[in-house]
Interface confidence: medium
């Protein structure tokens, strides 16, 4: 019979013959012959292959380097790579998460608009009129100025974007 020019899914053509690919998690040891099946072997510890393949070597799992602020989010298997993420307080510098940088803190006069995640930095916003922040924080929002009126007090010192208003007793002397 005519030798095949194309093979079915999960097969590959070699020496005019269709051989089965190795399943995910296994590597190729030897191609099939007229008389034998494809020979595959499982990937070793800390190795993986994530597709049907004819690779003779498995890929090494990614190393989550703690010196770069990385930790393991999901341990690799023989069929999947290790997924790294950043330690708490840090976020990835790229989609591949090859290294991490420290979350930014919002300085006094600025509040947190959006708390950082493992992949995005803190978003700070200036405290608008009527609000203040006197801390350097990766978590704290701008706080509203104290309402002196609701305490039956008057403003003795105006607030700023970094300081609260200072309330004091009402002047009882009236003309």
């Amino acid at each position: 019979p005519e030798p095949p020019t194309a093979c079915r899914e999960k097969q590959y053509l070699i020496n005019s013959q269709c051989c089965s690919l190795c399943q995910p998690g296994q590597k190729l040891v030897s191609d099939c012959t007229e008389f034998t099946e494809t020979e595959c072997l499982p990937c070793g510890e800390s190795e993986f292959l994530d597709t049907w393949n004819r690779e003779t070597h498995c890929h090494q799992h990614k190393y989550c380097d703690p010196n770069l602020g990385l930790r393991v989010q999901q341990k690799g298997t023989s069929e999947t790579d290790t997924i790294c993420t950043c330690e708490e307080g840090w976020h990835c510098t790229s989609e591949a998460c090859e290294s991490c940088v420290l979350h930014r803190s919002c300085s006094p006069g600025f509040g947190v608009k959006q708390i950082a995640t493992g992949v995005s930095d803190t978003i700070c916003e200036p405290c608008p009129v009527g609000f203040f922040s006197n801390v350097s924080s990766a978590f704290e929002k701008c706080h509203p100025w104290t309402s002196c009126e609701t305490k039956d007090l008057v403003v003795q010192q105006a607030g700023t974007n970094k300081t609260d208003v200072v309330c004091g007793p009402q002047d009882r002397l009236r003309a």
């Epitope: 602020g69 307080g89 420290l102 979350h103 930014r104 803190s105 006094p108 006197n134 801390v135 350097s136 924080s137 990766a138 978590f139 704290e140």
Partner: nanobody, 118 residues
Framework: EVQLLESGGGLVQPGGSLRLSCAAS????????MRWVRQAPGKGLEWVST????????YYADSVKGRFTISRDNSKNTLYLQMNSLRAEDTAVYYC???????????WGQGTLVTVSS
Amino acid sequence: EVQLLESGGGLVQPGGSLRLSCAASGFTFWVYDMRWVRQAPGKGLEWVSTISATGVHTYYADSVKGRFTISRDNSKNTLYLQMNSLRAEDTAVYYCAKYPPAGRFDYWGQGTLVTVSS
């Protein structure tokens, strides 16, 4: 100069409790977020918990959630870690750290050793 002095560690049986303290000086304590990290024997640093400057926001590692409580007293410049239902795997040297550091966890005290063993 930033100084952090941890205390309150010791030997405790599994299921027991301890309260760690961290006395801070050399910086305006109430302005900064603070955190606890720990280092088990032969292991790397592990983040435990973070508290925001005013104490409104608290965050915990999954391994301690529901058992540990972080708090602070800004009038006393002191950070606390209440540790309940302690397990053998909580054995470590515990450090408090200012956030953000100039580098990675760069302001250290001498740490306080917590040993959980029967």
